[in-house]
C-alpha cells in the first residue's frame, strides 16, 4: 500500500490522543533506554509504511502484535485517513483473528514495541516531510 | 561486531539474472536493523538499490524496482540480491549493509560483477 | 529525485592541513544528511549522521555542519590515512536515497 495519500495530520492526531498512550501503557515497567532503537524513517509514507509492516507482520520471537490495543486503534486509524487502505488489509485482517487467541508479552514484543515509538516519534517530528 | 560478506558470480550475460548473496556474521538479521543492496559502477559514484528490514518490509529504489528482488533466509542469516534483465550498465561493484533505513553503517567489502557476453 | 552536488572535484591538500568539502542538496533535506568515506579498493565507512553526529569511532577532527540545502564536512588536520573520496548522502527522500559524485582529497 501507498501511504502517500493519507491525512496525515488526522493520523498524527489519532496517535498523540490514544495510540501513544496505549504504548505507554503496554511497555509499563520498562525503561525507555532498556532497548536500542535500529530502525527509523524518512518521510511520513515511510513511517507509516514500516509502522504497518512491524505492527501486523509476525517476527522472531513475536507472534503478533495485532490484537494488541495500540494496534487496532493504528489499523482503525489508517483504514479512515488513508484511502484504499481497508481493501488492502483482508489477509491483515484474517492475522489479527488468528492472533487473538493468545495474547503474551515476550521481551522481544516489547523491544518490537520500543521500536514502533521511535517510528511513530518520527512521523510526528515537524519537519518531517510529507512525501 | 558485525561482519557482512557479499558472494555470487563475477560475470553474467546480458538479458540474464543477476544474483547476489549476503552473509552476516556477529549479529542475526531477523533482530533488528535493515539489510541493504548498494552498488558502485567503476570509477563512479553510489546508487542505493533497497532494503529489507528485521521484520520484513521491503523497500526499493524506484529506477530499480520493476528489476529487482531481495530477500532474506534467516536460518542461513543470509539476505539476497536479484537483478533481472541486466545489461552493460549494471556492471558494478555491489555492496552489501547494515541500515537503520536511513544511512549505512557497516558494509560488505564488496562483489564486482560484470555484464558481458 | 534529490540531486546531491558535491564541490570541490578534487581537494589538493598536504598532510595537517584542514579541509572543507562542501555537499549541496537540490532542494531541503533538513538535516537527514550522512558523509561517507571511500579508501581505494574498500567499502564506504560512515563518518557522519543526521549532519553533525559522529559515527562510533570516527576521530573528533571529522566534523559536520549544516541543515536544509547546505552542508560542510571539515577534517581539522589531515592525518596521511584521510586521503580518500568522500560522499554525503540525503535520506530525507525515501525511497529515492541518493548520493553525491564524491570529493577526492589528495595529498598535495
Known amino acids: 500500500y501507498d501511504f502517500t495519500n493519507c491525512d496525515f495530520e488526522k493520523i498524527k492526531a489519532a496517535y498523540l490522543s490514544t495510540i501513544s498512550k496505549d504504548l505507554i501503557t503496554y511497555m509499563s515497567g520498562t525503561k525507555s533506554t532498556e532497548f536500542n532503537n535500529t530502525v527509523s524513517c524518512s518521510n511520513r509514507p515511510h513511517c507509516l509504511t514500516e509502522i504497518q509492516s512491524l505492527t501486523f507482520n509476525p517476527t522472531a520471537g513475536c507472534a503478533s502484535l495485532a490484537k494488541e490495543m495500540f494496534a487496532m486503534k493504528t489499523k482503525a486509524a489508517l483504514a479512515i485517513w488513508c484511502p484504499g487502505y481497508s481493501e488492502t488489509q483482508i489477509n491483515a485482517t484474517q492475522a489479527m483473528k488468528k492472533a487473538r487467541k493468545s495474547k503474551v508479552t515476550t521481551n522481544k514484543c516489547l523491544e518490537q514495541v520500543s521500536q514502533l515509538q521511535g517510528l511513530w516519534r518520527r512521523f510526528n517530528r515537524p519537519l518531517l516531510k510529507q512525501q | 561486531q558485525v561482519q557482512l560478506q557479499e558472494s555470487g558470480p563475477g560475470l553474467v550475460k546480458p538479458s540474464e539474472t543477476l544474483s547476489l548473496t549476503c552473509t552476516v556474521s556477529?549479529?542475526?538479521?531477523?533482530?533488528?536493523?535493515?539489510w541493504s543492496w548498494i552498488r558502485q559502477p567503476p570509477g563512479k559514484g553510489l546508487e542505493w538499490i533497497g532494503y529489507?528490514?528485521?521484520?520484513?518490509?521491503?523497500s526499493y529504489n524506484p529506477s530499480l524496482k520493476s528489476r529487482v528482488t531481495i530477500s532474506r533466509d534467516t536460518s542461513k542469516n543470509q539476505f539476497s540480491l536479484k537483478l533481472s534483465s541486466v545489461t552493460a550498465a549494471d556492471t558494478a561493484v555491489y555492496y552489501c549493509?547494515?541500515?537503520?533505513?536511513?544511512?549505512?553503517?557497516?558494509w560488505g567489502q564488496g562483489t564486482l560483477v560484470t555484464v558481458s557476453s | 529525485e534529490i540531486v546531491m552536488t558535491q564541490s570541490p572535484a578534487t581537494l589538493s591538500l598536504s598532510p595537517g592541513e584542514r579541509a572543507t568539502l562542501s555537499c549541496r542538496a537540490s532542494q531541503s533535506v533538513s538535516n537527514n544528511l550522512a558523509w561517507y568515506q571511500q579508501k581505494p579498493g574498500q567499502a564506504p565507512r560512515l563518518l557522519i549522521y543526521?549532519?553533525?553526529s559522529r559515527a562510533t569511532g570516527i576521530p573528533a577532527r571529522f566534523s559536520g555542519s549544516g541543515s536544509g540545502t547546505d552542508f560542510t564536512l571539515t577534517i581539522s588536520s589531515l592525518e596521511p590515512e584521510d586521503f580518500a573520496v568522500y560522499y554525503c548522502?540525503?535520506?530525507?527522500?525515501?525511497?529515492?536515497?541518493?548520493f553525491g559524485q564524491g570529493t577526492k582529497v589528495e595529498i598535495k
Open positions: 529489507i528490514s528485521y521484520y520484513g518490509s521491503i
Open positions: 548522502q540525503q535520506y530525507s527522500d525515501w525511497p529515492q536515497y541518493t
Open positions: 556477529g549479529y542475526s538479521i531477523s533482530s533488528g536493523y535493515g
Open positions: 549493509a547494515r541500515t537503520n533505513l536511513l544511512y549505512f553503517d557497516s
Open positions: 543526521d549532519a553533525s
